[in-house]
Structure formats: structure tokens, C-alpha cells
């Protein structure tokens, strides 16, 4: 049986059940390399409380559909009067990066995971030439996830203080120059994640090979190497390589750009101070507020919730968008879709799509940007579920009693973008990270 998601095969992936202090290792095509779980374990559960290992999915007992992967075991689970076996179930959804498997829950018999990944899309529009896992768990099982930094087109311009050259990088994947053919990037070779531009020439100085690594708490490292043997004539016989160190700042701050800290014989060292390198719980909330010791800030968007069936309306040329954030009130146009954002075609109001659901909500405050994300909406033809990204700006003189209103700014590949000026986005900082 062929591997169902070949682009995910090269790595052993990790997921965590934080509630029970359990680390899962997952290899969807072969077996994880953990002796204690046996030679054919595809899903190995490491219980850090008891320092024990249990195989909860066997690579030999795999069954797959386009969107579901199940690994059975021969271990019986004591559900009364049944003959069930312990198994793992991974539900795949289309995403714009390789993504990460997320632990959902576990019953007596089944360990459930969900994975939003390019590998599950119906079309190849989001697939990279080369992409590596872009997250890591630290020794306290806290997740550090750089997936939001991955550019689907274009690249980051590294601050290198050299007027003659420009170094461009992407995070965890190669630079896509076709979707955004910026004049400088157009010459970058396919597959490169680090592209050195000199005049009208561009050189591949690194491609992703290994996934993100944690070197110590709040310092993550990504390494790129030039795979093919052909040496560049300005590298003094050395093979080019790029090391990017992502640093979580010691306190809340605005975002910075990546900086070149050392260069010698085409070995480039880059440091990037970004809050995306901090653990995810520091940046994100599933509710509409971020507060407490953990986050160093106080943010509460719940006053933006609309009651009594009314919604915010944002005009998007062909479409009207109805938004109801931070609540669970059904939008009338999107009745029974559990939509937080509802897209209605102006020329045919029967054409209605959920552009993100209220129970699929993430509030994120990172590098000075406050964003509310609603995902899991109706599918587009690519298989990607529509989502909405609302970027908030602090405005103490916003109309509508300080609430302001969302403004539609555009759509890219079934992701809908809004900006929203409101006094409720004014962030109060604490100082004890």
C-alpha cells in the first residue's frame, strides 16, 4: 500500500497532550525509532509522568482514506463487553503549510489527532518544492510554532548592511518566486530557501533539509544547506550554508527583521528576534482575551460581540461579509453554519459561504500584531477550508462607541483579510515574562 501523504513521510512528527503530560511521536509512513514502542510502532506515546512508552498505533495495521489515517494495534482496551483494540486516528485537512499534527482527545480506545497540511489538499497550489517541519516542543512540552512566519510567496530581506548584495530567506520552505515574482527574487533558483542576490544574478545558498530544532529555551535553530555539489566561485571552495536562530525576546516588543550576525566563506548566520519563537501559549488564546502572568498583556475583545442577531457588515466588491466575533450568535444569512464570518454574493444572495466558524477561533498577539483568526469554514475547490484573518489596530477614538467596524482588505487563496480599528485593541502591557 502506497504512502498516502508522501511529503509527510520524511520526518517523525510530534504532538502533545498537555493535560496529561504525554508526548506522541508519529511516523505516518514507516515506524518511529523508539525501541520501547517496538519495531513497528507508527504512533508511540511517551508518558512523561511515569516515564513509560506505549505503542498506540502499528504501522503494519494502517488503513487510509484521502482524509483519514488509522493505525490499529493488537492491544485490547477495556471498554466493557467489547472487543476493541487501542488505535490512533489522524484526520487530515487542507492547509497552506506542512503544518503540525495536533492532539485532539483520547478515549479509552482511540487517540485522535487533526492535521491541517498541504499534503491533504485536492490541488497542489500550496505545495512547496521543499519544506520541513516548522515547530518544536521544548523540554516542558510547550509548543514553539514558526508556521505563521512561512511565506507562501516572496521572501524576507535580511538586514546585512552590505550595499552590493541582498540575502533573502524564507522560513522552513523554499522561496516561491512564481506566485510573487518580485524583480529581485525572479532570478532565484527553484528550491532555494536562502537566495543571495548580487546585481542581476541570484545564487542558491541554502535549502531546507532538517526541521526546526530547539537549542535551549526560547532559542530555535533552522539550518539550510546547498545540496548539489557545484561550488560557488566566491565561496573559496566551501559549501554555502545558512543558520537562522530565532530568539524569543525577554519581554513584549514589536517585530524585528532578521539580521545577519556573521558571514564567512558563504556561511551565513542570521539572528531573528521574534515572539513567534516563544511558546504558543504566550502568543495565543482560544478565547477573545489574552491576559494573566502567562501572556504579559491584557487584551479583551469580548465587548465587540454583537447581540440580538445583528452583525458587522463589511463590503468586499462582489461580496458582503457579515461578521459576529467573540460570540456564538448565528449570523442569519449563514443560518446553522456556526459562522463567525459569513460571505454572501451580492448578485445572488443564495450563494452563502462560512468564511470561518466561531468555535474555530484563535486570538494571537505576536510581534506587536493583534490578530483574530477564524478557520474551518466552507471548502474551496482546493480543499482548503475558508478562513478569515482580522488584523486589529488600537484606535481610542473609534466610532460606534469605540467598537469601530471591520474593513475587508482582500482575499488570497480562500483566506479573507480584514482590518479593524477599535479601542478594544489597545493593549495593556505587564512586564514579567
Amino acid at each position: 500500500q502506497a504512502a498516502p501523504f508522501p511529503e509527510l513521510c520524511s520526518y517523525t512528527w510530534e504532538a502533545v497532550d498537555t493535560k496529561n503530560n504525554v508526548l506522541y511521536k508519529i511516523n505516518i509512513c514507516g515506524s518511529v525509532d523508539i525501541v520501547q514502542c517496538g519495531p513497528s510502532s507508527a504512533v508511540c506515546m511517551h508518558d512523561l509522568k511515569t516515564r513509560t512508552y506505549h505503542s498506540v498505533g502499528d504501522s503494519v495495521l494502517r488503513s487510509a482514506t484521502r482524509s483519514l489515517l488509522e493505525f490499529n494495534t493488537t492491544v485490547s482496551c477495556d471498554q466493557q463487553g467489547t472487543n476493541h483494540r487501542v488505535q490512533s486516528s489522524i484526520a487530515f485537512l487542507c492547509g497552506k503549510t506542512l503544518g503540525t499534527p495536533e492532539f485532539v482527545t483520547a478515549t479509552e480506545c482511540v487517540h485522535y489527532f487533526e492535521w491541517r497540511t498541504t499534503a491533504a489538499c485536492k490541488k497542489d497550489i500550496f505545495k512547496a518544492n521543499k519544506e520541513v517541519p516548522c515547530y518544536v516542543f521544548d523540554e516542558e512540552l510547550r509548543k514553539h510554532d514558526l508556521n505563521p512566519l512561512i511565506k507562501l510567496s516572496g521572501a524576507y530581506d535580511v538586514d546585512d548592511s552590505d550595499p552590493d548584495t541582498s540575502l533573502f530567506i524564507n522560513v522552513c520552505r523554499d522561496i516561491d518566486t512564481l506566485r510573487d515574482p518580485g524583480s529581485q527574487l525572479r532570478a532565484c533558483p527553484p528550491g532555494t530557501a536562502a537566495c543571495l542576490v548580487r546585481g542581476h544574478q541570484a545564487f542558491d545558498v541554502g535549502q531546507p533539509r532538517d526541521g526546526l530544532k530547539v537549542v535551549r529555551k526560547d532559542r530555535l535553530v533552522l539550518s539550510y544547506v546547498r545540496e548539489e555539489a557545484g561550488k560557488l566561485d566566491f565561496c573559496d571552495g566551501h559549501s554555502p550554508a545558512v543558520t537562522i536562530t530565532f530568539v524569543c525576546p525577554s519581554e513584549r516588543r514589536e517585530g524585528t527583521i532578521p539580521k545577519l550576525t556573521a558571514k564567512s566563506n558563504c556561511r551565513y548566520e542570521i539572528e531573528w528576534i521574534t515572539e513567534y519563537a516563544c511558546h504558543r501559549d504566550y502568543l495565543e488564546s482560544k478565547t477573545c482575551s489574552l491576559s494573566g502572568e502567562q501572556q504579559d498583556v491584557s487584551i479583551d475583545l469580548t465587548p465587540l460581540a454583537q447581540s440580538g442577531g445583528s452583525s458587522y457588515i463589511s463590503d468586499g466588491k462582489e461580496y458582503l461579509f457579515y461578521l459576529n466575533v467573540c460570540g456564538e450568535t448565528e449570523i442569519q444569512f449563514c443560518n446553522k453554519k456556526q459562522a463567525a464570518v459569513c460571505q454572501v454574493k451580492k448578485s445572488d444572495t443564495s450563494q452563502v459561504k462560512a468564511a470561518g466558524r466561531y468555535h474555530n477561533q484563535t486570538l494571537r498577539y505576536s510581534d506587536g500584531d493583534l490578530t483574530l483568526i477564524y478557520f474551518g469554514g466552507d471548502e474551496c475547490s482546493s480543499g482548503f477550508q475558508r478562513m478569515s484573518v482580522i488584523n486589529f489596530e488600537c484606535n481610542k477614538t473609534a466610532g460606534n462607541d469605540g467598537k469601530g467596524t471591520p474593513v475587508f482588505t482582500g482575499e488570497v487563496d480562500c483566506t479573507y483579510f480584514f482590518t479593524w480599528d477599535t479601542e478594544y485593541a489597545c493593549v495593556h502591557h505587564h512586564h514579567h515574562h
Epitope: D17, T18, K19, N20, N21, V22, K49, C77, D78, T105, A106, T107, E108, C109, H111
Partner: nanobody, 116 residues
């Protein structure tokens, strides 16, 4: 005051059965992961069984197929049903509660002796 109290231990013949109980107070019981451990005289404390907050269960190889862990959230109690007991099961049995927001909480222990 967060507390765990074990009960149900005692003297039993080889091949016999016992049911240990661990009653919790002062915690949201269903949010907690519950573990049973045991400590035989002169030996280190060893893990016996786990019942996670979600419901999955795991057992040490030495008790697999003989012991069953379960919980009753309405009574804030976790149980350890022990069948086919062996002399090497003789130990003090402890229950432990843990969650991301609490430090681990241990009970005082209950003595189980398997002897003819």
C-alpha cells in the same frame, strides 16, 4: 484543602481480589489525570496504572490483564480493581492526581498484603 484518601487495602490470599478506592476532595476531579503507584518494602515506588483525564488507560506490564483502573466522577473517586493477586503484589498502594495547573497530589497510601 486538596486531599486524596486511599482505602480498600487488606490481607488477601494469592489468586484473590481487592478493590482499592481513592477519594478526592478540593479538586475538579474530571480534569485530573489519576495514577496508581505502589511501594514494596525496601524497594522504590513503582507505577502501576494511569487513567488520563480524557479516559485512556495504561498499565505496567506486571499488572496488565489483572488490574483495572476506573473512575466515578460523581463520587470523585478512582478505583483499582486487582484480580489474580500474587505475593509480589504486596506493597503500599498510593494514588496520585495531577493536572497542568496543580502540583502532583499524593494520597497517604493503603497496605495490600498477599499471603497464604
Amino acid at each position: 484543602q486538596v486531599q486524596l484518601q486511599e482505602s480498600g487495602g487488606g490481607l488477601v490470599q494469592p489468586g484473590g481480589s481487592l478493590r482499592l478506592s481513592c477519594a478526592a476532595s478540593g479538586i475538579i476531579f474530571s480534569d485530573n489525570r489519576m495514577d496508581w503507584y505502589r511501594q514494596a518494602p525496601g524497594k522504590q515506588r513503582e507505577w502501576v496504572a494511569t487513567l488520563a483525564s480524557y479516559g485512556w488507560k495504561t498499565y505496567a506490564d506486571s499488572v496488565k490483564g489483572r488490574f483495572t483502573i476506573s473512575r466515578d466522577n460523581t463520587k470523585n473517586t478512582v478505583y483499582l480493581r486487582m484480580n489474580s493477586l500474587k505475593p509480589e503484589d504486596t506493597a503500599v498502594y498510593y494514588c496520585k492526581a495531577s493536572s497542568p495547573v496543580l502540583n502532583d497530589i499524593w494520597g497517604q497510601g493503603t497496605q495490600v498484603t498477599v499471603s497464604s
